[in-house]
Interface confidence: low
């Protein structure tokens, strides 16, 4: 669904808004579902295919074929007591280039690291006739004209603007959708010293028989490892579960990792013992500790060392 409340699009391209209660809308077929637009001159005008030949309404989606400058404004989807709002800003196409500078996604890639560009558009996939990949507005000759892909180890020569252009037909008209990446190739970046986020010692207030999730987050390098250690033998307590580690790359090319330790049906044996989370790398290790404390004993601990 289209969850971003503020959206910028380029005039002349197909565009869609998909509300985020789509599965719910299917369940309640009889419920009235309405789309509205408001702009400077008009307040809450209901949209329907008669509003404009460029607009199409489906179960969950408002489509523009294509979107134009005068489509700028606020859009609302309403169903029963559910409302979703978007602010749409339609900008001018750059007539002198194959892409519009304001609609460029920047990516930094380290030299010799894996570099990949894949031209995909899941929503319009079935309507796409062909797709071309351009580098600095010059077409690249790639075998696959359905989903052109570059996969290689980055070289400095790879720097540039890569534009995926999808060509599609709708109601006898030809449209294209452009997605552009500004690829910057940089020197190898030295490793950071990994660090765990938050206090080094955390007292967590719990109730016996309840569950608790201990979240361990770190800023680290790609090859660093984050792990939990607890008790005499790791993994021997059937009530303790490690959840999947989540990793997100930061704009600087480092990683933000998060690993949750889930303790179910808390017992006496889980209280007042150390649950240690460690991040390890060539730059050393960093450890933070969690101690479960019965809520009744909270008063004995200074407030500044408490996490809830």
């Amino acid at each position: 669904c289209t969850s971003r409340p503020h959206i910028t699009v380029v005039e002349g391209e197909p565009f869609y808004l998909k509300h985020c209660s789509c599965s719910l809308a299917h369940e309640i077929e009889t419920t009235t579902k309405s789309w509205y637009k408001s702009s400077g001159s008009q307040e809450h005008v209901e949209l329907n295919p008669r509003s404009s030949s460029r607009i199409a309404l489906h179960d969950c989606v408002l489509e523009f074929w294509p979107v134009e400058l005068n489509d700028t404004g606020s859009y609302f989807f309403q169903m029963k007591n559910y409302t979703q709002k978007w602010k749409l800003n339609v900008i001018r196409r750059n007539k002198h280039s194959c892409f519009t500078e304001r609609q460029v996604t920047s990516k930094i890639v380290e030299v010799k690291k894996f570099f990949q560009i894949t031209c995909e558009n899941s929503y319009y996939q079935t309507l796409v006739n062909s797709t071309s990949l351009y580098k600095n507005c010059k077409k690249l000759l790639l075998e696959n004209n359905k989903n052109p892909t570059i996969k290689k180890n980055a070289e400095f020569e790879d720097q540039g603007y890569y534009s995926c252009v999808h060509f599609l037909h709708h109601n006898g008209k030809l449209f294209n959708i452009t997605k552009t990446f500004n690829i910057t190739i940089v020197e190898d970046r030295s490793n950071i010293v990994p660090v765990l986020l938050g206090p080094k010692l955390n007292h967590v207030a719990v109730e016996l028989g309840k569950n608790v999730r201990l979240n361990c987050s770190a800023l680290l390098n790609e090859e660093d490892v984050i792990y939990w250690m607890f008790g005499e033998e790791n993994g021997s307590d059937p009530n303790i579960h490690e959840e999947k580690e989540m990793r997100i790359m930061t704009p600087e090319g480092k990683w933000h990792a998060s690993k949750v330790l889930r303790i179910e049906n808390i017992g006496e044996s889980n209280l007042n013992v150390l649950y240690n989370c460690t991040v390890a790398s060539t730059g050393g290790t960093d450890t933070k500790s969690f101690i479960l404390v019965r809520k009744a004993d909270m008063a004995d601990i200074p407030g500044h060392v408490f996490t809830r």
Epitope: N191, L220, N221, E222, E223, D224, V225, I226, Y227, W228, M229, N234, G235, E242, E243, K244, E245, R247, W255, A257, T278, A280, S281, T282, G284, T285
Partner: antibody
Framework: EVQLLESGGGLVQPGGSLRLSCAAS????????MSWVRQAPGKGLEWVSA????????YYADSVKGRFTISRDNSKNTLYLQMNSLRAEDTAVYYC???????????WGQGTTVTVSS | SYELTQPPSVSVSPGQTASITCSGD??????ASWYQQKPGQSPVLVIY???NRPSGIPERFSGSNSGNTATLTISGTQAMDEADYYC??????????FGGGTKLTVL
Amino acid sequence: EVQLLESGGGLVQPGGSLRLSCAASGFTFSSYAMSWVRQAPGKGLEWVSAISGSGGGTYYADSVKGRFTISRDNSKNTLYLQMNSLRAEDTAVYYCARIRGDYRTDIWGQGTTVTVSS
Amino acid sequence: SYELTQPPSVSVSPGQTASITCSGDKLGDKYASWYQQKPGQSPVLVIYQDSNRPSGIPERFSGSNSGNTATLTISGTQAMDEADYYCQAWTHSLSTLFGGGTKLTVL
């Protein structure tokens, strides 16, 4: 070139001991967790043990817990597996492997053969 | 204790799609990897973190993991893909385990 080279395998009697080594080259050894995986003749892969990059965290399969000890010397770029109280069922090819932080066991050694027999 | 179950063998004709499954309790909650092993050789990683392909591995290899089942799919199977395939799940930090292995035969 990134490489792992195991050594120390051989024939040993039941109840005996053996120490396997794995020499790493071509990468910053201390940055990576490492593991030992074995394969009995004609059988599948079995995870044996793993150790974090610093050596602070060690993990063992139930079948070897209390008998095997994993360790590493980052100054020598070497991984070890100390195997005590060996049994016939420990007979296998032992591989050392590198674990990346994104759960990629991407580099494997060529393996060293351990035979436990009287 | 946790177990991963794979079919002992799968057969496929050249050019066809081969699917190898790996099942375990709530396997979708864990990260799955897949390895290819040819006779007398060390295992080679073909899929990690459920669906990621290491560089150098052909695009015909793909993976998915949800519910209780992880699947390795080889589209346009070639004779060179004949090998044993093992799934792997990360169960606890650096602890892991492997499935029993599947022998892929390209007819």
